[in-house]
């Protein structure tokens, strides 16, 4: 006998994760078999939705993989023609685990500054979020605070809220943590201790002293009237992100000296400045005519140079003339550093026979300057294309330091050895030897002023030179 | 009483291929869902196909989809499993069983005696 | 694929004991599962479906409970002829799929 559709199993609400499997249950009772259909939201489900199962006739509906999208009010009517049409209706819940959609980032903030570290989320039943740095749950105060999206917001922020964090999303589900996100808090560069004024005796030595502190930590130059300090010797020393700057200047005008401590925040930099005068008691420029005496070497910059034993003009317009002189060695073969190996050894002799001239002893000691010829040797074979950038930097102002100047002759002021062999001292390790002449490198583009012998690359310690002429 | 007595089992090479079928008797073959599950020897029950009662609803297991096919013959009270591309982990006991609608989804109360299949070089 | 896992995999047990069995579904599946008790060289038998509903000529000392994701077979006074394995099967995707079964054996 014809019956009408009898639904026997109600529709439930069905409780189902993302991803997961979702199955409503309608069993019918009925004769002839009744045609059933589904819907979501009163909205038909079509059979042919691969996202969709239906089995028995279509008293079981599976979806397949749960969306979030899929929440709703599920119903399912049956009609075999006899008597009226039967629904049952029920509902789909989409439980979620907590999920982080937007995670914390590491994050750099100056000091003072507000920073927040973002944690969206998402789930059902909607996540609480709460915060971990270190190992600790990290306690909300007047500054710190979980804002209702998740995000943690620091106000102020401190030297001491620098540390790794994650955050935490939890509901009844689960818990999802984030990865660990590093919140680095920068400082301003500023100076602890600021170089002090000095009144002094021409040719002294002075340390300057300037201390700094940041983070990131400091670095700090330093300034000479207004250009980059091209002399004196600087140390440096960091400590628990203190830096320690002392600049040794050995004295030959007065002038300003400053420090400048800088540190970088992403594109951006901090500086902070401190400055100190140097003035010269009684200060005159030195004369020409100084005077000085012989004595030997006893200084270690120059000893392979040297003759050993040499004696050397000291001057005596330097509160210490040996130091002093010593010094203008050092400074200038700091800069030789970078010159070529072929440059090198001949600067360093040149230098040292300019600056620690040899002496000539009697009742005025008398300094015997470089010959002419060695000097051009130096300048426009061994060394042309460093010579070429040194002048050019000297023209420029880079070099305003006098010891700087002090320390590189003027080829064309010195004597010539053709004048009287006497009157100018010969380097001793540039030792000519008519033989050698094939082996000379190729002489440099720039043309020589005057003639002046081929000398081949050799080591350190020993160079043969070639004369194009007769030197004796 | 219900019967479920397959046939068609035997041994093929790997690549080849071999009908299975499922002769039902004892109830009204048309108003059931009818499944396969198989056994290879000395392991567990594996689910391989289900089809609805009209033949409408059509479903396999990963395992097998693309290579088997899953068919009914209402006025022969037949149930088929055409199987292709045979591989030796396809080697089982093959069983063909009622499904039956419950309170809470479906379940096999009626299993045939099974049909060995051997898959081998 | 929703994963049926039972455990244990295997259990002794003697004569009049009473033992339980579970199987745990990778998701929820409300009450969808059902139990089947496979003898040597015969076909599965249908015990319990439903989550706890007796099959029709089933003895009354098998039992079901469970539902979500958690279910129990629970065998009170085993006899002789219940030394068997054991499977549990989901049919709440029409991708239905059994556990790995468990071993009940004579102690």
């Known amino acids: 006998l014809p019956k009408a559709p009898v639904i026997t199993t109600p529709l439930e609400t069905v409780d189902a994760l993302v991803e997961e499997v979702a199955t409503f249950m309608c069993a019918v009772e009925s004769y002839p078999q009744p045609e059933i259909s589904w819907t979501r939201n009163k909205i038909l489900i079509k059979l042919f939705d691969t996202r969709y199962s239906i089995r028995e006739n279509g008293q079981l509906l599976t979806i397949l993989s749960v969306e979030d999208s899929d929440d709703g009010i599920y119903c399912c009517t049956a009609n075999n023609g006899v008597g009226g049409a039967v629904e049952s209706c029920g509902a789909l819940q989409v439980k979620m685990k907590p999920k982080i959609t937007r995670p914390p980032i590491n994050v750099k903030i100056i000091e003072g500054l507000k920073a927040v570290l973002p944690c969206t989320t998402m789930g059902n039943p909607k996540p609480s979020v709460s915060w971990i740095k270190g190992d600790s749950p990290l306690r909300e105060n007047s500054r710190i605070a979980v804002l209702e999206s998740g995000s943690l917001r620091i106000h102020n922020v401190q030297k001491e809220d620098a540390g790794q964090y994650r955050c935490v999303a939890k509901n009844s589900l689960g818990t999802a943590y984030s990865k660990v996100v590093k919140l680095e808090v920068e400082v301003f560069a500023r100076i602890l201790r600021a170089p002090e004024s000095h009144n002094v005796t021409f040719g002294s030595f002075v340390t300057l002293h300037c201390t700094a502190t940041g983070i990131p930590v400091p670095t700090i130059t330093w300034i000479e009237n207004g250009n980059a300090v091209s002399s004196g010797s600087i140390q440096e020393s960091v400590k628990d992100r203190v830096i320690d700057s002392r600049l040794q200047l050995f004295i030959t005008k007065p002038g300003l000296y400053t420090c400048i401590a800088t540190n970088k925040h992403g594109e951006k930099f901090s500086t902070a400045k401190a400055a100190a005068t140097i003035s010269i008691a009684e200060w005159s420029k030195p004369q020409k005519d100084n005077k000085g005496y012989c004595a030997q070497y006893r200084g270690e910059v120059c000893n392979a140079v040297l003759a050993k034993d040499a004696l050397v003009f000291l001057n005596t317009s330097y509160a210490d003339p040996e130091e002093a002189q010593e010094l203008l060695v050092h400074t200038a073969w700091n800069e030789l550093k970078v010159v070529s190996p072929v440059c090198r050894p001949a600067a360093e002799a040149l230098l040292c026979n300019h600056i620690f001239q040899e002496c000539s002893p009697g009742v005025v000691p008398t300094p015997i300057p470089i010959c002419r010829e060695y000097c051009l040797a130096v300048k426009e074979l061994f060394c042309a294309k460093e010579w070429l950038v040194m002048e050019e930097k000297t023209h420029r102002g880079l070099y305003r330091s006098e010891m700087h100047l002090l320390s590189v002759p003027e080829c064309s002021k010195l004597p010539s050895m053709h004048w009287d062999p006497t009157a100018c001292a010969r380097l001793p390790h540039l030792d000519y030897n008519k033989e050698n002449l094939k082996t000379f490198p190729p002489m440099t583009s720039s043309k020589p002023s005057v003639d002046i012998p081929n000398l081949p690359s050799s080591s350190s310690s020993s160079f043969s030179v070639s004369p194009t002429y007769s030197m004796t | 009483e219900v019967q479920l007595v397959e046939s068609g089992g035997g041994l093929v090479k790997p690549g080849g291929s071999l009908r299975l079928s499922c002769a039902a008797s004892?109830?009204?073959?048309?108003?059931?869902?009818m499944d396969w599950v198989r056994q290879a020897p000395g392991k567990g029950l594996e689910w391989v196909s289900s089809?609805?009662?009209?033949?409408?609803?059509?479903y396999y297991a990963d395992s097998v989809r693309g290579r088997f096919t899953i068919s009914r013959d209402n006025a022969k009270n037949s149930l088929y499993l055409q199987m292709n591309s045979l591989r030796p982990d396809d080697t089982a006991d093959y069983y063909c069983?009622?499904?039956?609608?419950?309170?809470?989804?479906?379940?096999?109360?009626?299993w045939g005696r099974g049909s060995l299949v051997t898959v081998s070089s | 694929d929703i994963q049926m896992t039972q455990s244990p995999s295997s259990l002794s047990a003697s004569v009049g004991d009473r033992v339980t069995i579970s199987c745990r579904a990778s998701?929820?599946?409300?009450?969808?599962v059902n139990w089947y008790q496979q003898t040597p060289g015969k076909a599965p038998r249908l015990l319990i479906y439903?989550?706890?509903t007796l099959q029709s000529g089933v003895p009354s000392r098998f039992s079901g409970s469970g539902s979500g994701a958690n279910f129990t077979l629970t065998i009170s006074g085993l006899q002789p002829e219940d030394f068997a394995i054991y499977f549990c099967?989901?049919?709440?995707?029409?991708?239905?799929?059994f556990g790995q079964g468990t071993k009940l054996e004579i102690k």
């Open positions: 069983a009622r499904g039956q609608l419950a309170v809470a989804g479906t379940h096999f109360d009626y």
């Open positions: 439903a989550a706890s």
């Open positions: 089809i609805g009662s009209n033949g409408d609803y059509i």
């Open positions: 004892g109830f009204t073959f048309s108003s059931y869902t």
């Open positions: 099967q989901q049919s709440y995707s029409p991708l239905c799929t």
């Open positions: 998701q929820k599946v409300n009450k969808y």
